[in-house]
Amino acid sequence: LMGGQDKPFLSARPSTVVPRGGHVALQCHYRRGFNNFMLYKEDRSHVPIFHGRIFQESFIMGPVTPAHAGTYRCRGSRPHSLTGWSAPSNPLVIMVTGNHRKPSLLAHPGPLLKSGETVILQCWSDVMFEHFFLHREGISEDPSRLVGQIHDGVSKANFSIGPLMPVLAGTYRCYGSVPHSPYQLSAPSDPLDIVITGLYEKPSLSAQPGPTVQAGENVTLSCSSWSSYDIYHLSREGEAHERRLRAVPKVNRTFQADFPLGPATHGGTYRCFGSFRALPCVWSNSSDPLLVSVTGNPSSSWPSPTEPSSKSGICRHLH
């Protein structure tokens, strides 16, 4: 990982993918330590700041511009050698985002998947991107790259992720790049949370006052388990969004969340899942489905939830 005998290892924190105007720390690790180092950019553009300068432990680059995008190498200090410097490090590609309109990102068959399944993340745009990049939040490695396929005025790429395991759950974004500027990426797509289910024991789901209610009667769905889940997620069949609530410890040593659905107007099939704060995108097995039936005059839709849900944000902590 740290390069050869006389070769330093250049890395970027927090990521090699940097938003325009952002900052990134470049570290040159040499001979079991972070020594003094020199930095080079392969195309030699836009780096007067490097010329003849020696950096200590890390180099903080920014606010970055499109001209910062490119391939970097470092040389570590080697006082007793002929040149005083090591061999060049591994190449490190810095990609700068925010240079073109954002693409769209979709999950097939969907963003909620069982452990072991495979998901296709499709990135597409009406901008004729030559390459698409897929990046998972919090990962410092280079993003996956695919050549864009152009068809009917749309460029797209299908990224296959799987078999799914906890480490692959998280928030994904994709970017596009145009020919001749391969490391100047578009603005990020809207974030897409990939959730893996089936890792822990299922919670139980019940309805108060019961699963069959009169139209207009207030309904609360309770999700509970003996497992010390931090968060419960409630989904309704046919709806893209889930609702989530913090679990509350009860006197009977269970952990429970009560989802108030408000006055009943329309039935539906509900499921709930539990998750832990440390792995917000890794969920339990689904509870048994609960069919809520409404007698009387069912209208076409259930009232909007008391707190709005969003396409993303599942993988962020509940504060």
Partner: antibody
Framework: QIQLVQSGSELKKPGASVKVSCKAS????????MQWVQKSPGQGLEWIGW????????KYAEDFKGRFAFSLDTSVSTAYLQISSLKAEDTAVYFC???????????WGQGTTVTVSS | DIVMTQSHKFLSASVGDRVTFTCKAS??????VAWYQQKPGQSPKLLIY???TRHTGVPDRFSGSGSGTDYTLTISSVQAEDVAVYYC?????????FGGGTKLEIK
């Protein structure tokens, strides 16, 4: 949004010490550095130096070596400037500003007035 | 140390005028020049860096140009809220140094 909030004004006697704090929010503290700039009465802006928030390594301008010291508490995203053996000529407004090795200071604190008077 | 000279201490303009601030470096700074705006009672704000890159949220009436030792900041159509002191700064080599500032006044 990115914000740098500095501690309040200080009135000190010559020979005393002062510690100015600069609390950052809205970005990952350790991916940037903190620059410090002095604005003396009737004077322009003068760069004191900066500290790399990733490595903790400070760098000082020649005129500010010795009595000026930078430190960090990354657990609370805060940078500090300490000035010891204060002199009347240290009377100034001190600014912290986010920036790295490239010397561009993209967000600034509101400034802390330090007055040194007997 | 690199000396940055802003020859005009004051500039006066009417609303809607085009105004240009100049800055001269004592040596070639290879386009590593930033411009800051300091309004009365406020801290400086970054406008431009690397000679011509506008900082996030800066109106496009502000633009920068230059190379070698000579750099300019232009406001294409001055607004009343642009009353401030404008500083140039070289970010080519440490110590980073600032010009003495030019105060923009509205007629």
């Amino acid at each position: 949004q990115i914000q740098l909030v500095q501690s309040g004004s200080e009135l000190k006697k010559p020979g005393a010490s002062v510690k100015v704090s600069c609390k950052a929010s809205g970005y990952t503290f350790t991916t940037a550095g903190m620059q410090w700039v002095q604005k003396s009465p009737g004077q322009g802006l003068e760069w004191i130096g900066w500290i790399n928030s990733h490595s903790g390594v400070p760098k000082y301008a020649e005129d500010f070596k010795g009595r000026f010291a930078f430190s960090l508490d990354t657990s609370v995203s805060t940078a500090y400037l300490q000035i010891s053996s204060l002199k009347a000529e240290d009377t100034a407004v001190y600014f912290c500003a986010r920036g790295g090795d490239e010397g561009v200071m993209d967000y600034w604190g509101q400034g802390t007035t330090v007055t040194v008077s007997s | 140390d690199i000396v940055m000279t802003q020859s005009h201490k004051f500039l006066s303009a009417s609303v809607g005028d085009r105004v240009t601030f100049t800055c001269k470096a004592s040596q070639d700074v290879s386009t590593a020049v930033a411009w800051y705006q300091q309004k009365p009672g406020q801290s400086p704000k970054l406008l431009i860096y690397w000679t011509s890159t506008r900082h996030t949220g800066v109106p496009d009436r502000f633009s920068g140009s230059g190379s070698g030792t000579d750099y300019t900041l232009t406001i294409s159509s001055v607004q009343a809220e642009d009353v401030a002191v404008y500083y140039c700064q070289q970010h080519y080599s440490t110590p980073w140094t600032f010009g003495g500032g030019t105060k923009l006044e509205i007629k």
